[in-house]
């Protein structure tokens, strides 16, 4: 009788074993071992013993141990099974991005792998299983469609295999793909809302504000704003699932017309854009000219005022004869001139909405100085210990420098509170002195003595 | 009444120097711009310089610039030309005189004058 | 600088006479102008400044018209006393440029 042992082997892939081969009869005409595997017979004492290594087994094998005795001839087979972990696990591509709502079929492929009995195939979210199914066919294959919800964002899925030899008395072998991160992502239908001036004057800076409600995830949102081949640099401000992108654009003269505005929002695979069209247009203030701006009185002065060709102006509220971009008045200045404005407006249709500009130059008027009755008088009479006040106001542009002496030596103090003595009395030479030359007053004071019943 | 009085003139060598006093009296002295004017033997009166009330600004002649220095001590009530590098073409009465009134930001006509003092440069 | 010029440098004329002394500055000085009188071996003397007003203590004979660049001196009735030199002045800046004289004598 012919036995084997172990008569039942797992080993893994490439690994070696040891076989004895038996014979229960003392003196056998013939023991060994019939197999395609590399094998090499340990040297033992006895006759019905053989040990032979067996190595580089890479299939399962039933490697088959023989005797001839006198009895007769018999066989005893041993059944090697290998074991090992697949050459490839891997999820089928996906683009990262996927929007909500959409079914998305995860697909593993799974290359090699043995005993198959013993392999299974696990779909995984996270560590949550999806799927598990035993290996089947080469490459097995499981799939499995999972609906996108918002909540996946960021979810990493992944397909594991299970070698399960356990049962075998050996280990749980574990290969798992490399993850597959889903990036979950809404646009909405609407395109963004732009909101920017729909004329925009050259070498001036214009605000541009481009915004969008009912995104996920928002920050992962793109904006990109342009005006016509300018690209803008926004700041972007990002609440729950809205964004607003605020952006600064200066034109030049060279802008000048229509020109396109785009605002596209770009998420995942997906772009929503706005399109509106921004006229650019020169609108210099228009030019208030004074043949001085300032003069003496007496001067004969012009007023002129000149706009944009196609502007119509207004000067002092007065429009132009005719209509247009040119105005002018004729005045002689007079000291009521002295800081008179005037102002011209002038109006520009861009694109239908009226642009206004305005310029403004005030005229001065040098007069003076003045010294009058009114303001300086002549002659004040003050009891003597009252307290008064000595007043004299000159006028003039500029204003002029006052002063009062008497005898060349003592000042009047004016506009000061004195009390009336008898050194004030006397004729004061009052002075008015300004860049338009000088005036001069004599102003007496008489100071009343207490009478002594 | 205001009085100027003047004192320091004399007979000087061309390129030597010479310092020209000038008192005040019965007027408050430090309220007034101070000037010097000259007047050569058989000409007109030339001004030459001027002081501001407090002595922080002071304005000068072509003719002398460079060469005459005005200055003041209010606290001794006297006006002074330093004359230095002097030419016979300085020969003059020299003459102080008073801003009629203490403006502010000018000068004005002179309503007191000293009574002169002589200059020769002679070698 | 701004120039000064008298014209005429010297004049005769008979007591009693009216006279006038003409003074022009070469930019416009508005009435920063003044007269002085000067008697031989002594100061000069304030007559006139901002080119009308008298001096206190100066006869009213003595009157200044004038304003921007052309003024005058009149001696409206010329005494004896009033032999003299006359000098105006420009005094709104410096220098504080004088004429060059006018000397008046009598008849």
């Known amino acids: 009788q012919t036995s084997v042992s172990p008569s039942k082997v797992i080993l893994p892939r490439g690994g070696s074993v040891l076989v004895t081969c038996s014979t229960s009869c003392d003196q056998p005409k013939l023991l060994g071992i019939e197999t395609p595997l590399p094998k090499k017979e340990l040297l033992l004492p006895g006759n019905n013993r053989k040990v032979y290594e067996l190595s580089n087994v890479q299939e399962d094998s039933q490697p088959m141990c023989y005797s001839n005795c006198p009895d007769g001839q018999s066989t005893a087979k041993t059944f090697l099974t290998v074991y090992w972990t697949p050459e490839r696990v891997e999820l089928a591509p996906l683009p990262s991005w996927q929007p909500v709502g959409k079914n998305l079929t995860l697909r593993c492929q799974v290359e090699g792998g043995a005993p198959r009995a013993n392999l299974t195939v696990v779909l995984l979210r996270g560590e949550k299983e999806l799927k598990r199914e035993p290996a089947v066919g080469e490459p097995a294959e499981v799939t499995t469609t999972v609906l996108v919800r918002r909540d996946h964002h960021g979810a990493n899925f992944s397909c594991r295999t299970e070698l399960d030899l356990r049962p075998q008395g050996l280990e749980l072998f574990e290969n798992t793909s490399a993850p597959y991160q889903l990036q979950t992502f809404v646009l909405p239908a609407t395109p963004p809302q732009l909101v920017s001036p729909r004329v925009l004057e050259v070498d001036t800076q214009g605000t541009v504000v481009c915004s969008l409600d009912g995104l996920f995830p928002v920050s992962e949102a793109q904006v990109h704003l342009a005006l016509g081949d300018q690209r803008l640099n926004p700041t972007v401000t990002y609440g729950n699932d809205s964004f607003s992108a605020k952006a600064s654009v200066s034109v030049t003269a060279e802008d000048e017309g229509t020109q396109r505005l785009t605002c596209a929002v770009i998420l995942g695979n997906q772009s929503q854009e706005t399109l509106q069209t921004v006229t650019i247009y020169s609108f210099p203030a228009p030019n208030v000219i004074l043949t001085k701006p300032e003069v003496s009185e007496g001067t004969e002065v012009t007023v002129k005022c000149e706009a944009h060709p196609r502007a119509k102006v207004t000067l002092n509220g007065v429009p132009a004869q005719p209509l247009g971009p040119r105005a002018q008045l004729l005045l002689k200045a007079t000291p009521e001139d002295n800081g008179r404005s005037f102002s011209c407006s002038a109006t520009l249709e861009v694109a239908g909405q009226l642009i206004h500009k305005n310029q403004t130059r005030e005229l001065r008027v040098l007069y003076g100085p003045r010294l009058d009755e009114r303001d300086c008088p002549g002659n004040w009479t003050w009891p003597e210990n009252s307290q008064q006040t000595p007043m004299c106001q000159a006028w003039g542009n500029p204003l002029p420098e006052l002063k009062c002496l008497k005898d060349g030596t003592f000042p009047l103090p004016i506009g000061e509170s004195v009390t009336v003595t008898r050194d004030l009395e006397g004729t004061y030479l009052c002075r008015a002195r300004s860049t338009q030359g000088e005036v001069t007053r004599k102003v007496t004071v008489n100071v009343l003595s207490p009478r002594y019943e | 009444q205001m009085q100027l009085v003047q004192s320091g003139g004399g007979v000087v060598q061309p390129g030597r120097s010479l310092r020209l006093s000038c008192a005040a009296s019965g007027l408050t002295f430090s309220s007034y711009g101070m000037h010097w004017v000259r007047q050569a033997p058989g000409k007109g009166l030339e001004w030459v310089a001027v002081?501001?009330?407090?002595?922080?600004?002071?304005y000068y002649a072509d003719s002398v610039k460079g060469r005459f220095t005005i200055s003041r001590d209010n606290s001794k009530n006297t006006l002074y030309l330093q004359m230095n590098s002097l030419r016979a073409e300085d020969t003059a009465v020299y003459y102080c005189a008073k801003d009629f009134y203490n403006w502010n930001d000018w000068h004005d006509a002179f309503d007191i004058w000293g009574q002169g003092t002589m200059v020769t440069v002679s070698s | 600088d701004i120039v000064m010029t008298q014209s005429p440098s010297s004049l005769s004329a008979s007591v009693g006479d009216s006279v006038t002394i003409t003074c022009r500055a070469s930019q416009d000085i508005s009435n920063y102008l003044a007269w002085y009188q000067q008697k031989p071996g002594k100061a000069p003397k304030l007559l006139i400044f901002?080119?009308?007003t008298l001096q206190s203590g100066v006869p009213s004979r003595f009157s200044g018209s004038g304003s921007g660049t052309d003024f005058a001196l009149t001696i409206s009735s010329l005494q004896p006393e009033d032999v003299a030199s006359y000098y105006c002045?420009?005094?709104?800046?410096?220098?504080?440029?004088f004429g060059p004289g006018t000397q008046v004598d009598i008849k």
């Open positions: 002081i501001s009330y407090d002595g922080s600004n002071k």
């Open positions: 002045q420009k005094y709104n800046h410096v220098p504080q440029t």
């Open positions: 901002a080119a009308s």
